[in-house]
């Protein structure tokens, strides 16, 4: 840093006093010199570092006529809303000629009440579930003290007792406040208060108990919530998208989602308005008077097959001597699942009914044993699935083939040996 | 249980120090806490005149500043209070006292009542 | 300095009876205003700390109330162990300062 030397008298006739004040303070330090000749800048040091952005005036006042006399030079430094980094040793430094001058020393200090850098904040917790807060203050003068309290109520009876910088709170079970103190030997600061808002703990063991094809029965096990009742819970259902795929831990689904609101207890719900043979994700919240748990994992689940809802359509069926030929389209009501095929009754007039599964074919021709000339045959046709028939279409009177109808052209399929019957 | 006992001279000479001696039983003084003297005036008014902390840093009024100084020896468990260049005005009852963090003080000494007088 | 004007001085009451100490600061202290008893041959007893917070193992019929420059302790139900004298304190700033008393006497 640098030094005056002593071969010439020190220029400075007044030096930096001192300033010892709390954070915020604005304060100024002064210097004067007189010295001959044209008049030097004046430099400020903080702990012998030149100050480059140094809030500084400075005034010259000749005391004679002319340029060669000697001049007053007064600096002056402001220190506006004093901090820590301010602190240290200030002293005014001049170059005349080739010689370097510096003034006594002058000292800036802080102290005052204890200032807070982290301050507890608000937050929520879920019931019983540990958490910590922080707070950290200063000086000086130090040593600074924390006292937590919760509920206006201290933690602890004596310092180096209680928690200081972070405050470890193995759980609570009702809405509480915090807020902690700074002491030192300037008095007490206060720090905000933080509002820990107990919600209930996120559900368990989300689970299917019964399975339809278009409602789901779920079930789950609460959570804690405190002293807090449960008021209802919230269940989600989204379908499942394989192309975006629901993450266990995603927040939000990729889709609107079906929500029911169920009272509790009991902790159960019965989703309805579902799409059979569909996989769904659900997950699962609960609501007290202080807000929701968070979401359950998000479940993956299915809803089953059921049977087609309607008959097949548009179903012919013609006779030609001992041949029939059955044609029909797929249903149009839901199939509520995957189409396994057909099948399809007959009977006539004083028979017994014939029972055939068709498989996935639309049409088919069927062998008639004897002559042909059983009065009143009729067709059923039901479509099928996993889950079982579908209902049956109205029974479809046998025509006589007329000449110019078309007949359709596929294997022909025997009558089933067994039961074997023929038509008198 | 916390005990703080004072001992010291019962009567001190105009202009000299007051010397005095806080024995705490029960809690170490580096543990926690900070750790006071008070004095008493006839007549019952009370002025806190500072206090050492479990750290070892110390804390004056300034009323005193310039006369008192406190210390402590933490192998004897013990603080101790100089108050120097005495007149009568510093005649009272001197009381060590420990202070619940910067609060109030939850244990007292019974007291020791010192005389300044030629 | 923060100065603290206590009242009153004196005051004198029966068992059973209900009473009020007043303290005053000159200045704002928050909260942090406590009380004491004094008894002779006893040692300082804490009752009440940070205006309102009660001192372990000090009966609930002793109460504090107030904040900022207006503080009041109030006992209900006198007992015959209460008469005593009673000082107020402020610890919100250094030096910690007291009020000048109050003696507690049975009418």
């Known amino acids: 840093a640098p030094r005056g030397t002593q071969a010439e008298e020190s220029p400075f006739v007044g030096n930096p006093g001192n300033i010892t004040g709390a954070r915020g303070l604005t304060g100024t330090l002064r210097c004067q010199l007189q010295v001959q000749g044209e008049p030097p800048e004046v430099h400020w040091l903080r702990d012998g570092q030149i100050l480059e952005l140094a809030d500084s005036t400075q005034t010259q006042v000749p005391l004679g006529e002319d340029e060669q006399d000697d001049w007053i030079v007064v600096s002056q430094l402001r220190i506006t809303s004093l901090q820590l980094s301010d602190t240290g040793q200030y002293q005014c430094l001049v170059f005349l000629g080739h010689q370097t001058f510096v003034s006594q020393p002058g000292y800036v200090g802080l102290e005052g009440l204890p200032y807070f850098l982290e301050e507890p904040e608000d937050r929520t917790v879920a019931a019983n579930t540990p958490f910590n807060l922080s707070c950290q203050a200063q000086g000086p003068p130090e040593p600074v003290d924390l006292l937590w309290l919760q509920d206006a109520v201290p933690l602890a009876t004596a310092p180096g007792h209680g928690p200081q910088r972070s405050l470890h709170v193995p759980g609570l079970n009702k809405t509480s406040s915090f807020s902690c103190e700074a002491h030192n030997a300037k008095g007490v600061t206060t720090s905000r208060t933080a509002t820990i808002t107990v919600l209930p703990q996120q559900p368990r063991n989300l689970h299917l108990v019964s399975r339809q094809p278009t409602e789901l029965e779920v079930a789950w096990t609460p959570g804690l919530s405190g002293i807090y009742p449960l008021t209802h819970c919230t269940l989600q259902a989204v379908l499942s998208d394989d192309g975006m795929g629901i993450q266990a831990g995603e927040p939000d689904p990729p889709e609107e989602p079906l929500t029911s609101q169920a009272s509790v207890p009991p902790h159960q719900l019965r989703l309805g308005s579902l799409h059979p043979h569909t996989p769904y994700h659900i997950r699962v919240a609960c609501t007290s008077s202080q807000g929701p748990s968070s979401w359950t994992h998000w479940l993956p689940v299915e809803t089953p097959e059921g049977v087609p809802l309607g008959p097949p359509e548009n179903i012919s069926a013609t006779r030609n001597g001992s041949q029939a030929f059955v044609h029909w389209q797929e249903p149009r009501a839901p199939l509520q699942g995957t189409l396994l095929g057909y099948r399809l009754a007959y009977q006539g007039q004083d028979t017994p009914e014939v029972l055939m599964d068709i498989g996935l074919r639309q049409e088919v021709t069927l062998e008639l044993q004897g002559d042909g000339s059983v009065s009143n045959l009729t067709v059923c046709v039901a479509a099928y699935t996993a889950a079982g028939d579908g209902p049956w279409s109205l029974p479809v009177p046998l025509e006589a083939w007329r000449p110019g109808q078309a007949q359709p052209v596929h294997q022909l399929v025997k009558e089933p040996s067994t039961p074997a019957f023929s038509w008198p | 249980d916390v005990q703080l006992q004072e001992s010291g001279p019962d009567l001190v000479k105009p202009s000299q120090s007051l010397s005095l001696t806080c024995t705490v039983t029960?809690?170490?003084?580096?543990?926690?806490?900070?750790w006071h003297w008070i004095r008493q005036f006839p007549g019952n008014k009370l002025e806190w005149m500072g206090y050492?902390?479990?750290?070892?840093?110390?804390n004056y009024n300034p009323s005193l500043k310039s006369r008192i100084s406190i210390t402590r020896d933490t192998s004897k468990n013990q603080f101790f209070l100089q108050l120097n260049s005495v007149t009568t005005e510093d005649t009272a009852t001197y009381y060590c006292?420990?202070?619940?963090?910067?609060?109030?003080?939850?244990?007292w000494g019974q007291g020791t009542s010192v005389t300044v007088s030629s | 300095d923060v100065q603290i004007t206590q009242s009153p001085s004196y005051l004198a009451a029966s068992p059973g009876e209900t009473i009020t100490i007043n303290c005053r600061a000159s200045?704002?202290?928050?909260?942090?205003l406590a009380w004491y008893q004094e008894k002779p041959g006893k040692t300082n007893k804490l009752l009440i700390y940070?205006?309102?917070t009660l001192q372990s193992g000090i009966p609930s019929r002793f109460s504090g109330s107030g904040s900022g420059t207006d503080f009041t302790l109030t006992i209900s139900s006198l007992e015959p162990e209460d008469f005593a004298m009673y000082y107020c304190?402020?610890?919100?700033?250094?030096?910690?300062?007291f009020g000048g008393g109050t003696k507690l006497e049975i009418k």
């Open positions: 050492i902390h479990y750290s070892g840093s110390t």
């Open positions: 200045k704002s202290i928050s909260k942090y």
């Open positions: 304190q402020q610890h919100n700033e250094y030096p910690w300062t």
């Open positions: 006292a420990r202070s619940l963090w910067f609060y109030a003080m939850d244990y």
């Open positions: 029960g809690y170490s003084i580096t543990s926690a806490y900070s």
């Open positions: 940070s205006g309102s």
